[in-house]
Amino acid sequence: VPRWRQQWSGPGTTKRFPETVLARCVKYTEIHPEMRHVDCQSVWDAFKGAFISKHPCNITEEDYQPLMKLGTQTVPCNKILLWSRIKDLAHQFTQVQRDMFTLEDTLLGYLADDLTWCGEFNTSKINYQSCPDWRKDCSNNPVSVFWKTVSRRFAEAACDVVHVMLNGSRSKIFDKNSTFGSVEVHNLQPEKVQTLEAWVIHGGREDSRDLCQDPTIKELESIISKRNIQFSCKNIYRPDKFLQCVKNPEDSSCTSEI
């Protein structure tokens, strides 16, 4: 008799998920000598244990605590780059500016980046057919709870000046419902963080507007100021030139505004 299976609205677990997580972990520990002590098999077992045999709409931050413990990592707290809706450029930036870190430059972020996963209640199977969608099904799903957990911890660790890259091409440059807007902003510690500096990335070549005056940026400024953290904002009019100047700061064209 075929067993009834819940059909969720979201895509299923990424194919070859266990092997992918293990492979990423091994690669990360090879590249980062300070994480050589990490046992990737234990990391996978803890990752799997967070969601296997559990209802995929009933996952808690507590489920991920064994994984969080194994993935504990110290990054320079004053070198943190947050981002919202502009992941690729943020990652390109930290690949050049090697002393700055996005969440996906940490072990746990690197393991899960762009992956989907879920299990089923009372079976040890991974569900490769479908997983819950945050909007259509439930918010307490394995992927969403994972990112909420690691994002909160990442923001809590930040100090001094924290940078955030925001997408100036979107209707809501700052979105209260994004992970940045709903989790990270509220978990920056005012006793440690002096300033949040927003970098608003322009999309159009001829876009010379001051997007730091956008109403959603003003909303972000208000939220941050109420938390006793200073706020500053910069327009990045030419993201291509911005990256080029990070690579070659001595270039003569890098003295002008970018």
């Epitope: 266990p18 492979a23 090879e30 990490v38 098999q41």
Partner: nanobody, 122 residues
Framework: EVQLLESGGGLVQPGGSLRLSCAAS????????MSWVRQAPGKGLEWVSA????????NYVDSVKGRFIISRDNSKNTPDLQMNSLRADDTAVYYC???????????????RGQGTLVTVSS
């Protein structure tokens, strides 16, 4: 270049013991899980046992549980397999392998050595 060189195989009587060793080089040893797989005459490859990078986790196929012990020394880059209470059906070429790890009884292998023959016969 990754190199895995097995040693310790040979002829042993049923009920006897052997210890297989593997000299590993060319990769960050402690980052990788290590495993032993075997191939009996005329049969396919069978995964036997694996050990995680730190040595904290081990896994065994049911047929060798309680008889075989896998271990590793990360200072010497050597995974070993202590085989006790050997039986005729343990006769096989035993290969040392490095890999990413395992999920259940699925072993994710990257490299494998040339093998060492273990013959269990009276």
């Amino acid at each position: 270049e990754v190199q895995l060189l097995e040693s310790g195989g040979g002829l042993v009587q049923p009920g006897g013991s052997l210890r297989l060793s593997c000299a590993a080089s060319g990769f960050t040893f402690s980052s990788y899980a290590m495993s032993w797989v075997r191939q009996a005459p005329g049969k396919g490859l069978e995964w036997v046992s694996a050990i995680s990078g730190s040595g904290g986790s081990t896994n065994y196929v049911d047929s060798v549980k309680g008889r075989f012990i896998i271990s590793r020394d990360n200072s010497k880059n050597t995974p070993d397999l202590q085989m006790n209470s050997l039986r005729a059906d343990d006769t096989a070429v035993y290969y040392c392998a490095s890999g990413k790890g395992w999920d259940g009884n699925t072993w994710y292998e990257d490299y494998r050595g040339q093998g060492t023959l273990v013959t269990v016969s009276s």
